[in-house]
């Protein structure tokens, strides 16, 4: 061993970098001796600008170390990622992104909300981390069910909608005119019969939002990425399970004229009892027998399920019957109804507790004689399909 010391030169004493220490500390370092550098918490080993997890240098025969000592640099989490539909504020100081710096994410007020508090800290692993330990960005979820509409409007028997009344209303243009309801910033709820045959021919489906006038040249355009028709729906064999979802290629920006309708809460059933009033809007046929130019709406009461089923037994609709997956709305004497061209639109109700509107029904079918006495409008009962809707959205 003594000979081994003389055969090679000792290496110079290593100097610990600022905010770091060396181990082991020895009086001398000779051939094959090594040392490692460790940084204080909140600092990392950097060789230039490149991070290292560990550093060990070995003493060589010529009395030099085999690599240069890196620096211990303060952890820099870097500029935080942009938050879609939100923004970030630097709390610690302008553009400060180093260890223990704090930032605050916020969503665009009024139209988006965040479930967490949005506070993130630059931690020792170099990631912006929330108080719950999450390293992913918070999510700005669209607010749903806000409307300037107040119940009491007297598109059969209806009246014109005003801007912001039905911001979830979606116009579907294909071979025929239909409607849908925005339920997320990239999902539209509609009737299966309105999009039947569109699962493959999606490019023929023109989706428009943020409009009142059906023929308006100023609108927000969306295109379908996928169409999901309920597996229990059979085209031409009644309207049971008449529900579908359209996944949009791109998220739409939420504003006062484009906003999702809320899905019903578990308590929604108590708000949709017989004689409770819902509202439906659409560009479908009016009393005059033509498609409406302006978005029309009507407030209509829910009809007793048995009464509705009986009415359609007396005056059957070819190939259709009222099932438990449907709800009916209208007046015994008639005069208020949805009609052809309204299909897929939402029958909505105000949740008094949250003061938000939610979708209870989807315009599905009814007598050819829209608004006729005891010819109630039949709607897909959305509360029966919440698991189906959530399953598709969550698994897409």
């Amino acid at each position: 061993h003594h000979h081994h010391h003389h055969a090679s030169q000792p290496c110079p004493d290593p100097t610990a970098p600022p905010n770091g220490h060396i181990s082991p500390v020895q009086a001398t370092y000779v051939l094959k001796d090594s040392f490692s550098v460790f940084c204080k918490t909140g600092f990392e080993l950097l060789q230039g600008s490149v991070p290292l997890k560990s550093f060990t240098a070995v003493c060589q025969k010529d009395g030099s170390w085999d690599r240069p000592i890196p620096e211990c640099s303060i952890i820099d989490c870097g500029p935080p990622d942009d938050l879609p539909n939100g923004h970030v504020d630097y709390i610690t100081g302008p553009e400060v992104t180093t260890y223990k710096a704090v930032i605050q994410y916020s969503c665009e007020e009024t139209f988006y909300t965040m479930s967490s508090n949005g506070k993130y800290v630059c931690e020792a692993d170099g990631f912006w981390t929330s108080s719950k330990g999450e390293k992913s960005l918070p999510v700005c979820k669209p607010v749903c069910g806000l409307s300037t509409h107040t119940s009491g409007g007297r598109i059969i028997g209806g009246q014109p909608a005003k801007p912001g009344d039905f911001p979830w209303q979606v116009l579907l243009l294909g071979e025929t005119t239909a409607a849908g309801a925005l339920i997320h910033d990239d999902w539209v709820l509609t009737a299966a019969h309105a999009v039947y045959g569109k699962t493959e021919a999606m490019s023929s489906l023109d989706i428009r939002m943020g409009i009142l006038k059906r023929l308006s040249l100023i609108y927000t355009q969306a295109w379908p990425e996928a169409v999901f028709i309920h597996e229990g729906y059979t085209h031409g064999a009644g309207f049971d399970n008449d529900i579908a979802l359209i996944k949009l290629k791109n998220k739409v920006t939420i504003n006062r004229n484009i906003m999702p309708i809320c899905l019903p809460r578990k308590e929604a059933a108590s708000l949709m009892k017989t004689d409770f009033v819902g509202t439906v809007a659409g560009w479908g046929l009016t009393q005059k027998g033509f498609l409406a130019r302006n978005l029309m709406f009507v407030d209509i009461p829910i009809v007793d399920h048995q009464k509705c089923a009986t009415a359609y037994t007396k005056q059957p609709y070819p190939g259709a019957k009222v099932t438990v997956n449907m709800l009916c709305a209208g007046l015994d004497r008639g005069g208020k109804d949805s009609c052809r061209g309204d299909a897929g639109g939402a029958l909505v109700f105000l949740d008094n507790e949250t003061q938000r509107w939610f979708v209870g029904g989807i315009v599905s079918w009814g007598s050819i004689n829209c608004g006729g006495s005891e010819q109630y409008g039949v709607y897909t009962k959305v509360t029966n399909y919440i698991p189906w809707i959530e399953n598709i959205i969550n698994n897409f």
Partner: antibody
């Protein structure tokens, strides 16, 4: 012996996305170092695109920041390059390499053409 | 971005000669410079890191020197297999940048 191997399509159309995989054998990508993507244009100009470090942190060339994403799958010991909205200017040989550049893949040639 | 300038695009030398390839950084990069050798049809191979530290397996006829802005790769006793293009790279500051390359031809 440590090796890096790039894989991906040889041809991509303009405006599409490019996805490349670097499979590392003989060394765990979580053990240490930064794992880089570097490309070499016709004429031999080299450009560093970005890296993903042992901890999963990324650093990108600002000239590509809006289009690039580097991710990894630690269970497969792979890291990935995604480059969006490619143009003919992205035609190059793409290499994955370990810092200090002591190990490089053999490169994969990408042509962007309609 | 830091610009790494290799002013000599092509250098001619003979077997057994000593040749120096230079690289200039547009700003101070300390010793955070690497040198690569690329032979035709091959991927680059690391020769030197941190300005003067030889990578393992690299013949000791390759020597790196310099700090700050001026760096040199010296090949003493040039061999025919050294016919290649040589690139410098700074890793001091992101983005990491490369020189444009110097081709070495053997007379």
């Amino acid at each position: 012996q440590m090796q890096l191997q790039e894989s991906g399509p040889g041809l991509v159309k303009p405006s599409q996305s490019l996805s490349l995989t670097c499979t590392v054998t003989g060394y765990s990508i979580t053990s240490d170092y930064a794992w880089n993507w570097i490309r070499q244009f016709p004429g031999n100009k080299l450009e560093w695109m970005g890296y993903i470090s042992y901890s999963g942190r990324t650093s990108y060339n600002p000239s590509l920041k809006s289009r690039i994403s580097i991710t990894r799958d630690t269970s497969k010991n792979q890291f990935f390059l995604q480059l969006n909205s490619v143009t003919t200017e992205d035609t190059a040989t793409y290499y994955c390499a370990r810092h200090y550049g002591d190990y490089w893949g053999q490169g994969t040639t990408l042509t962007v053409s309609s | 971005d830091i610009v790494m300038t290799q002013s000599q695009k092509l250098m001619s030398t003979s077997v057994g000669d000593r040749v120096s390839v230079t690289c200039k950084a547009s700003q101070n990069v300390g010793t955070n410079v690497a040198w690569y050798q690329q032979k035709p049809g091959q991927s680059p191979k690391a020769l030197i890191y941190s300005a003067s530290y030889r990578n393992s397996g690299v013949p000791d006829r390759f020597t790196g020197s310099g700090s700050g802005t001026d760096f040199t790769l010296t090949i003493s006793n040039v061999q025919s297999e050294d016919l290649a293009e040589y690139f410098c790279q700074q890793f001091n500051t992101n983005p990491l940048t490369f020189g444009s390359g110097t081709k070495l031809e053997i007379k």
